[in-house]
């Protein structure tokens, strides 16, 4: 078969080829930021030629052009300066009321890169509708004025602008506009990962409502969707394999798929997974109907089997069919079930579709979805049991219009969007469903996003000042107590003057709580062994405190998960009966576990726990610490099985401050608390100049550093008497 | 927060030796690390030797190591530093420090003496 003639450079851009110049491959054109290529993309057709998408007239020289953001079409009751046909990258226009209205919205929003608005749609509003006034989004056409209950209200883009959103909005009883703003964007534009990330997410995590099974009192979030324990989701993943999707591309959509996956069972819900990939006809690699979607590995296991040549001899793009396949899954369901039973009434349906492009066969979408909608009994009563996300990826021949008829349309939310590439989307992926937004008290969650603060990453993590110096660090087990070490406490019982600092949004600085009770270990005495030649002994150097008042949870606070607990359990997705000992062959499992703890600036440092035989080459250096221990003859009595030991190769040793903070480790994205950080051999801030500043030791350091960190595994029966109607344990 | 004052300072010969004093108020020191930094003139203030609540640990800076002890006693709120073999590089303005973490960071530390001078020369 002929080639493509290789004459398509685009000034000031790049381009892509999906096959090479062979027919069926797809150029796809790139521009730096703030530019956008005309044309997106062509397509090697079986005669050798260069076809362009959509275009009439014979190919034209590729360019990179401005890009350029929505001018208003309308504004009321106000003004806008200036007034331009269109704006450009970095310009602003500002937004006035006249009076009598009150400005809702941004006064000022700024065109970016991808040809969107920054900030929200000014709205000048007096608060006399029953529900408030929708506003008109930049470039949009509104008819319809009055905002009473059961008022509609429609909309229109004006020129080439695409619509996303609903072009129909009804003011509702409560208050509320049914469905989601309406946008109008250039068919150029796309979404950045940082703006869909928690757009998603925040969708997503209203969907999963993510409550915690365990906790005492239900609450709820968001749009109020609880899937209790009963409850159940069904995730049915959608992966776009047709021809123009390069097998690399096809590889991220995979990869972003098990992160999707891989998070989706970090939360504390029962939940299946459909894995679909399609091009002209559907292949299910995983049914919700099969067992085996209940379980993570073989959902990820199915996925890694996805084969790019699976779809090699039908290439077109079906999405019809793809989202007819869901609906012949849950119609199977439901005759399995039964139609009346709760089991399937109260199942919740979750479709993420991952496409490149438009449906070019097999009908409209819009049926199938029409008859998924049918099927689950979809009215306002019951809208939360479905949620249908479009993500289009790589800007070239994604139909706006098409994503944003197939996605779900609920106030406040977004469920279509349009990535610029394939490696915006796996951003996305990692970092939409953070559960560290949620306010019920849901253990071990951190922030993993890279622009999250240490805060943020570690938010169990609490500062302990006895007056006005802070000596020592502690974690957040539950909403009102705190895991520190027994020898941050040596002035007697007096602690009224003590202070703990805990993770608050609202400020750097955190918020002082005042210790209600202190619970400090009996058999805690440094000077214990003092007639044994020990000068300092650190058994038993554990200390719990209950704080005055209870912690609003936030992404800045959040209790670390215990092992031994139900809620560890839920975290770790184990089984019912598992036991203590469970939880500590699955989480201290290898002879070196990688795990962290947090620096007196904040940042999480790691070091690796020595188990078994190594624990004991780890503990023998202690006998080389001639000042503390002066005349030791065994080890053991210095370093019991008490403690876990790090501090060798390549470990950050904890410095003083930092006694009392936990140690622990990540595990199914959530993390566990195996230890305390207690005493060492090495103080790498000693005399430094700020938080900032730690030495290593050097490498001829005799005693080399060591690190003991006391093992919750062995203060279990200390911990269930103190904490017994705090957490639910489980058996040892 | 506790009081500092040292004493023990003066001039003295390469090769000689010199014990400083710090005496604390205040019913806390037992509780507290205590500490040794020093300044020579037109230099940081940097870590000399520090000796824990307890007494039984000690650290020193490795230009002091094996010439200098640290040294407590709680019962007479009093921290020391017995300095031998000085060398005229020793010379600077000795301070005791009192720390509850046991860190003695510079930006953090609260409980300063005011200091006394040690000269070294022949």
């Known amino acids: 078969a002929p080639s493509c003639p290789q004459n398509v450079n685009i000034s000031g851009g790049t381009f892509t080829l999906s096959h090479g110049w062979a027919p069926g491959s797809l150029l796809t054109y790139s521009c730096p930021q703030g530019l956008y290529p005309s044309p997106a993309s062509r397509l090697c057709k079986s005669s050798g030629q260069w076809q362009t998408p959509g275009a009439t007239r014979s190919l034209s020289k590729a360019v990179c052009k401005p890009v350029r953001c929505p001018a208003p079409v309308s504004f009321e009751n106000g003004i806008y300066t200036p007034r331009l046909g269109s704006y450009p990258v970095g310009g602003n226009v500002s937004f006035e009321c006249e009076d009598g209205f009150i400005l809702r919205g941004s006064p000022v929003r700024q065109c970016r890169p991808n040809g969107m608005w920054d900030g929200e749609t000014a709205v000048c509003d007096n608060g006399a509708g029953h529900c408030p006034n929708p506003g008109i989004s930049l470039g949009a056409v509104r008819t319809g004025f009055r905002f009473g209950h059961g008022d509609k209200v429609r909309y229109r883009c004006s020129s080439n602008l695409v619509l996303t959103g609903s072009s129909e909005r009804e003011c509702q009883g409560n208050g509320v506009w049914s469905g989601t703003e309406p946008i109008c964007r250039q068919p150029y534009s796309y979404d950045f990962p940082e703006d869909v990330a928690p757009a998603l997410g925040t969708s997503f995590s209203h969907m999963l409502g993510a409550t915690n099974p365990t906790q005492k009192t239900k609450e709820s979030l968001g749009r109020k969707i609880q899937i209790q324990r009963s409850g159940h989701l069904n995730l049915y993943l959608l992966l776009d394999c047709s021809q123009s999707v390069s097998e690399n591309d096809f590889l991220i959509f995979k990869e972003s798929a098990s992160l999707m996956v891989d998070r989706i069972f970090s939360f504390e819900i029962n939940v299946s997974v459909a894995i679909i990939t399609f091009a002209s006809e559907p292949k299910v690699l995983m049914s919700v109907l099969n067992d085996n979607s209940r379980d993570m590995t073989e959902v990820i296991s199915s996925l890694e089997n996805a084969n790019y040549k699976d779809h090699e001899n039908g290439t077109g793009t079906n999405t019809y069919a793809a989202l007819n396949s869901v609906y012949l899954m849950m119609n199977n369901q439901m005759r399995l079930l039964g139609m009346e039973t709760m089991a399937w009434q109260e199942i919740r349906h979750a479709i993420i579709l991952l496409t490149d492009g438009k449906s070019n066969m097999g009908g409209s979408p819009k049926t199938a979805v029409d008859h998924i909608r049918e099927i689950l009994n979809i009215n306002q009563k019951r809208n939360d049991y479905l949620d249908i996300y479009a993500i289009g990826v790589g800007k070239l021949d994604v139909d706006w219009r098409e994503l944003n008829e197939l996605g779900s349309k609920k106030d406040g939310e977004r469920h279509a969007f349009i990535l610029q590439d394939t490696k915006a989307l796996h951003q996305v992926f990692e970092h939409m469903l953070d559960v560290s937004k949620l306010t019920d008290t849901i253990c071990g969650v951190g922030n993993m996003s890279a622009n999250a603060s240490d805060q943020e990453r570690t938010p169990w993590h609490v500062t302990i000042k006895p007056k006005s110096q802070e000596t020592c660090r502690g974690a957040l087990i539950s909403d009102q107590w705190v895991l520190t070490a027994a020898h941050c406490f040596r002035d007697g019982n007096d602690h009224s003057l003590w202070r703990v600092n805990v993770g608050d949004p609202k400020s750097q600085w955190g918020k002082e709580f005042l210790i209600e009770k202190a619970v400090i270990s009996p058999g805690f005495d440094v000077f214990a062994k003092k007639n044994q030649g020990i000068l300092e002994f650190y058994g038993d150097d554990i200390a719990l405190l209950k704080l005055a008042q209870k912690v609003k949870m936030s992404t800045h606070a959040r209790p670390i998960c215990l092992p031994c607990t139900m809620e560890a359990n839920l975290a770790l997705r184990r089984p019912q009966g598992s036991t203590c000992r469970d939880h500590e062959n699955e989480l201290l499992n290898k002879q070196s576990v990688p795990a962290h703890f947090v620096a007196l600036n904040g940042s999480k440092l790691n070091i690796n726990l020595k188990m078994g035989v190594e624990w004991t080459s780890c503990a023998e250096v202690v006998s080389q610490e001639k000042t503390m221990f002066p005349n030791l003859t065994d080890v053991r009595e210095v370093v019991t099985d008490q403690f876990l030991c790090s501090g060798t190769q390549e470990d950050e040793s904890p410095c003083k401050g930092e006694s009392g903070g936990a140690v622990f480790l990540e595990r199914r994205f959530r993390f566990f608390q195996v230890g305390l950080v207690s005493w060492g051999l090495y103080n790498p801030c000693l005399g430094s100049a700020d938080k900032n500043s730690r030495k290593r030791a050097p490498r001829s350091k005799v005693p080399p550093p060591r690190d003991f960190h006391i093992n919750l595994f062995r203060m279990q029966p200390w911990l269930r008497q103190h904490l017994g109607d705090v957490l639910n344990f489980l058996p040892l | 927060q506790v009081q500092l004052v040292e004493s023990g300072g003066g001039l003295v010969q390469p090769g000689g030796s010199l014990r400083l004093s710090c005496s604390a108020s205040?019913?806390?020191?037992?509780?507290?690390?205590m500490g040794w930094f020093r300044q020579a003139p037109g230099k940081e203030r940097e870590f000399v030797a520090s000796?824990?609540?307890?007494?039984?640990?000690?650290e020193y800076a490795d230009s002091v190591k094996g010439r200098f002890t640290i040294s407590r006693d709680n019962s007479k709120n009093t921290l020391y530093l017995q300095m031998n073999s000085l060398k005229a590089e020793d010379t600077a303005v000795y301070y005791c420090?009192?720390?509850?973490?046991?860190?003695?960071?510079?930006?953090?530390?609260?409980?300063w003496g005011q200091g006394t001078l040690v000269t070294v020369s022949s």
């Open positions: 420090a009192a720390d509850y973490s046991g860190d003695f960071l510079l930006s953090d530390l609260d409980s």
């Open positions: 205040g019913h806390t020191f037992r509780s507290y690390y």
């Open positions: 000796i824990s609540w307890t007494g039984g640990s000690t």
